[in-house]
Each structure stands twice: as structure tokens, then as C-alpha cells.
């Protein structure tokens, strides 16, 4: 056979679907790799072919489109499972070809089991909402294209495995779930179960979103440096270990890049000859405010090191802050001996 442009295994598309539920998977060629869409390709005489490699197998095989109840079918550039089975897990390939042209890409599909409380190995999208801040809506994700607009599905929302009925600030409204003045107690996994009929059969779509209530933009501040500060003096004798923590509080800001760094005599630690180690740790509050600590340490400090200027810097999208550490050499009182 002629050469085929092989885009390899597209691991960016780690598709996870629930066992025993419908799944519609679009061929990634038209979304990420080729400049034209399926209709254009089809009208140009190109054919889309699907095949797969089962989990833990090397052999590529054609997909069986003659299963009972048309369990697996292809419609335009979409591969349909009605529904999935556990052993559908594997790498799927879609290939677009005619006698002179060929392009293909593979992608992994994982069929995931869940229990009555929607616990599973599925990775859930995270929806962040501001604390005590207006009305937030989440929409049951990835249900487009499963049923026509003429079909009115039933939608039930759950928090964990409890149906959302009479929750004090959470209201299900069909495909949407509204949060009125969100609170930290609203954190958790919210699941919508969409049930719809098709050709005399009933299908369920289960979608879970993790809700995380975060700090409000009205509370957003530039970085606050807690340490070093003017009250603490790092007084050391030569040969001792010098340890200076730079502890910075960042209020939560959506998509903010929080940075902390030290300068020594105006230079980055890598650009000075001192033997310095810097260790960083990060902790988060319940609303994802961040406390970042960078500990600067010099194992055996020299008199020269104790004369240097150590400055902690911090930056977020709201601004910058800096604070010098007060470092001095300990004065050793002279020892008097009585003859």
C-alpha cells in the first residue's frame, strides 16, 4: 500500500468514557491535524476508515460494525458506541484515504467503570467559582450531539451520590445547576445523569464536574510578604548556618502566575559564587489562597556573606513586593581572664 501520513498516537486526547453508556468520538484528524473538515474530504472522494488495537494487543483489526443492535456504528466523522463495553478499551485509528492520498491518527480510548455513587477512575473537569460572589452556573458537559433538539431528556443532578433536592443554595434547572452565593461547603463532585430514549431504547449519560470555591476577585491583592520582615534580625557567627525563610501570601486570582525569588546583592542566586541552597514549599487555603515559602540557606556562612544584601521578591498579576532580610554578624564579646 502507498505511504500514509501517520500522525502517530495522539496522547493529548486521552478519551475516557463510562462503561454501559453511549459515546460519540470524533476523528481527531479534522479537529487537530488537517486543514479541511469531513464534508470537504468526503466530497473530494476520500473515505474514512476506522480500526483499533485492543488493550494489551499489538494487532490492528477492523472495527466490527455488524454487532447486534448496531452497538458500534460510524456516522460521518463520528464513531458511535451505543453503549460502550469494558473491553472496548484500546487504541482507535481513523484513516482518511483514496488511491493517491492517505492520512491517519490513533488515539487511546479508556472505558471506565463507575459505582452507584459515581466513584470511578475518571478524570473530572474542575469548575472554579468565587466565594460569596453572585450566581454561578455549571452546565452538564459533553452531551451535545447525543440526541436531537426534539428529544427532551430527563436530567438529575447529584452531589456525591445524593440527589440535589432542596439544597439551600444549589438549584437544578435542567442541564444547568445554579449556585447562589457559593460557599466553601459547596465544594465537591456534582454529577448530572442525562436519560434519553432512542429507537425504543433508553440511554444514560453520566457527567461529573468538580466544583472548587475559590477566593473572590474583590479580595485579590498584590503579594504579601510575611517573612523576612523588619522585626527579625538574622544574627550569625561566621561558620554557622544561615537560614532565611521568604514566606509570601498570594490571594487567589484566576489564572495568576505566582512567583517568589531571592536576590543576593541584586543578583539571582545562580549568578553568585556563594554555596546557597533554596527549597520551596507551597500550601493552600480552602479557597486556594496560596502561601509560598522559599527557604534560603548557606551551610557555613562567611563574614563576607553576612555583609550581603538578601532580598525576597514576589509577583502576581496584581503587583510586586520585595523585602530585604536583616542579616548581621554576631559580635562576640571579648573574654577576660583573671590572672
Amino acid at each position: 500500500s502507498e505511504r500514509c501520513d501517520d500522525w502517530g498516537l495522539d496522547t493529548m486526547r486521552q478519551i475516557q468514557v463510562f462503561e454501559d453508556e453511549p459515546a460519540r468520538i470524533k476523528c481527531p484528524l479534522f479537529e487537530h491535524f488537517l486543514k479541511y473538515n469531513y464534508s470537504t474530504a468526503h466530497s473530494s472522494g476520500l473515505t474514512l476508515i476506522w480500526y483499533w488495537t485492543r488493550q494489551d494487543r499489538d494487532l490492528e483489526e477492523p472495527i466490527n460494525f455488524r454487532l447486534p443492535e448496531n452497538r458500534i456504528s460510524k456516522e460521518k466523522d463520528v464513531l458511535w458506541f451505543r453503549p460502550t463495553l469494558l473491553n472496548d478499551t484500546g487504541n482507535y485509528t481513523c484513516m482518511l484515504r483514496n488511491t493517491t492520498y492517505c492520512s491517519k491518527v490513533a488515539f487511546p480510548l479508556e472505558v471506565v467503570q463507575k459505582d452507584s455513587c459515581f466513584n470511578s477512575a475518571m478524570r473530572f473537569p474542575v469548575h472554579k467559582m468565587y466565594i460569596e460572589h453572585g450566581i454561578h452556573k455549571i452546565t452538564c458537559p459533553n452531551v451535545d450531539g447525543y440526541f436531537p433538539s426534539s428529544v427532551k431528556p430527563s436530567v438529575t443532578w447529584y452531589k456525591g451520590c445524593t440527589e440535589i433536592v432542596d439544597f439551600h443554595n444549589v438549584l437544578p434547572e435542567g442541564m444547568n445547576l445554579s449556585f447562589f452565593i457559593p460557599l466553601v461547603s459547596n465544594n465537591g463532585n456534582y454529577t448530572c445523569v442525562v436519560t434519553y430514549p432512542e429507537n425504543g431504547r433508553l440511554f444514560h449519560l453520566t457527567r461529573t464536574v468538580t466544583v472548587k470555591v475559590v477566593g473572590s476577585p474583590k479580595d485579590a491583592l498584590p503579594p504579601q510578604i510575611y517573612s523576612p520582615n523588619d522585626r527579625v534580625v538574622y544574627e550569625k557567627e561566621p561558620g554557622e548556618e544561615l537560614v532565611i525563610p521568604c514566606k509570601v501570601y498570594f490571594s487567589f486570582i484566576m489564572d495568576s502566575h505566582n512567583e517568589v525569588w531571592w536576590t543576593i546583592d541584586g543578583k539571582k542566586p545562580d549568578d553568585v559564587t556563594v554555596d546557597i541552597t533554596i527549597n520551596e514549599s507551597v500550601s493552600y487555603s480552602s479557597t486556594e489562597d496560596e502561601t509560598r515559602t522559599q527557604i534560603l540557606s548557606i551551610k557555613k556562612v562567611t563574614p563576607e556573606d553576612l555583609r550581603r544584601n538578601y532580598v525576597c521578591h514576589a509577583r502576581n498579576t496584581k503587583g510586586e513586593a520585595e523585602q530585604a532580610a536583616k542579616v548581621k554578624q554576631k559580635v562576640i564579646p571579648p573574654r577576660y581572664t583573671v590572672e
Epitope: 454501559d20 453503549p83 469494558l86 473491553n87 467503570q113 438529575t156 447529584y158 433508553l202 444514560h204
Partner: antibody
Framework: QSVEESGGRLVTPGTPLTLTCTVS????????MSWVRQAPGKGLEWIGS?????STYYATWARGRFTISKSSTTVDLKMTSLTTEDTATYFC????????????????WGPGTLVTVSS | AFEMTQTPSSVSEPVGGTVTIKCQAS??????LSWYQQKPGQRPKLLIY???TLASGVPSRFKGSGSGTEFTLTISGVESADAATYYC????????????FGGGTEVVVK
């Protein structure tokens, strides 16, 4: 094709117990199997199901205390922290074949096994 | 949580009469409803599935109807062999279910 339950007996409260449903002529990779119980003089009560792929679903009241698992020819129901309220005949039932909905339509039932919880 | 309500709990009818049993779902179950017959000391037996489809070997005097939330089992020309308890059961979902079965209706044939 047949379904038969075993393992029912008299136990004291708090004792764990496992019931086994043995199937004959049924490929469990194609069928959902369910456990249903019936207390003396009372109605039918669904405990839970294991579908063809192995996922399990339970009644809200049964979560945590009952566990369903299956092998190629058996479906087990593990019960813990039994109380006198759990005294019942336990039935194993097969769901209709087909990929949707009908797996909770029980077309083949076992004769049941009696569990008595008494001190 | 999802509930199935079955009425009446008991009904008495002479031979040849008609028995009507109703079943109501707390939310739409489309046509995913089954009816079972259980005689004392015996296992339940599937009578009707998908609201109106007769299981194999079930006499045509049994008729199921309804969709959505309201369903009916009708036994026309009732016979003494029909004395039993009848249960409806939803098969639409296994989520958040206390019990997919209705409470049962005892049919006494006089």
C-alpha cells in the same frame, strides 16, 4: 439455563455471610445479574446488580453493607453487620439480554435461599 | 430518591371479572416498566416488560399499558390460577434507588 442460590442459613446478628448464585448455561459476560430479597410476608426488595462488564450498582440502603462480585459461573453477595431486619429469602435473578434498560428486567429467577438472623 | 407506588395493595374479584392494578413512578421511566407475578412460596415470574410486551408463555388476558409515570396491569377474564401477588418494577435507572419494585398487589380470586 438455570440460576440457583446457596449459602442461606441461620446466623446471629453481626455475623457476615456470603451467598452464592450459580448459573448454568448462562454466559455472565453477556448478562446483568441482580440480587433481590423478600422478608417473610413482605414485598420484593432490590439489593443490587452486577452488569455484564462487571460494574456494580446498589440500592441506596444497601451501599457499604452489601457487595456483589462475579466470576465466570457464580455471582456472590457478601453481607456484613447483619441484623434481624435482614431475615429474608434472597433471590438471584438474570436481566434480559440487550445493551440497555432491559438488564433490569428479570426474566429468570432462582428458587431463593433463606437467611435467618436471630440471636 | 426514585419511588414506585403501586395501588391497590389488595383486590378481590370473582372468576371472569377484570382486575386493574396501577403503578406510578416518581419520575418518567419512559416505557421501562415490568410486571411480575408471585404465588406463595414460589419465585417471581416475569409477565410483562417494556410496559406492554408479554413475556413468552404468558396468556393474553394479561395486558400492560402506560408510559412515562403512569402504568396499568389489566387482567381480563380472571381465573383462579391468577390468584397471586403482582409487582411492578422500573428498569430505567439504577441510580439513587431505594427500591425499583412497587409494594405489591394481592389478587384474591373468589
Amino acid at each position: 439455563q438455570s440460576v440457583e442460590e446457596s449459602g442461606g442459613r441461620l446466623v446471629t446478628p453481626g455475623t457476615p455471610l456470603t451467598l452464592t448464585c450459580t448459573v448454568s448455561g448462562i454466559d455472565l459476560s453477556n448478562y446483568a445479574m441482580s440480587w433481590v430479597r423478600q422478608a417473610p410476608g413482605k414485598g420484593l426488595e432490590w439489593i443490587g446488580s452486577v452488569i455484564s462488564g462487571g460494574s456494580t450498582y446498589y440500592a441506596t440502603w444497601a451501599r457499604g453493607r452489601f457487595t456483589i462480585s462475579k466470576s465466570s459461573t457464580t455471582v456472590d453477595l457478601k453481607m456484613t453487620s447483619l441484623t434481624t431486619e435482614d431475615t429474608a429469602t434472597y433471590f438471584c435473578a438474570r436481566g434480559c439480554p440487550g445493551y440497555n434498560g432491559d438488564k433490569y428486567t428479570f426474566d429468570l429467577w432462582g428458587p431463593g435461599t433463606l437467611v435467618t438472623v436471630s440471636s | 430518591a426514585f419511588e414506585m407506588t403501586q395501588t391497590p395493595s389488595s383486590v378481590s374479584e370473582p372468576v371472569g371479572g377484570t382486575v386493574t392494578i396501577k403503578c406510578q413512578a416518581s419520575q418518567s421511566i419512559y416505557n421501562y416498566l415490568s410486571w411480575y407475578q408471585q404465588k406463595p412460596g414460589q419465585r417471581p415470574k416475569l409477565l410483562i416488560y417494556r410496559a406492554s410486551t408479554l413475556a413468552s408463555g404468558v396468556p393474553s388476558r394479561f395486558k400492560g399499558s402506560g408510559s412515562g409515570t403512569e402504568f396499568t396491569l389489566t387482567i381480563s377474564g380472571v381465573e383462579s390460577a391468577d390468584a397471586a401477588t403482582y409487582y411492578c418494577q422500573q428498569g430505567a435507572t439504577s441510580y439513587d434507588i431505594e427500591n425499583p419494585f412497587g409494594g405489591g398487589t394481592e389478587v384474591v380470586v373468589k
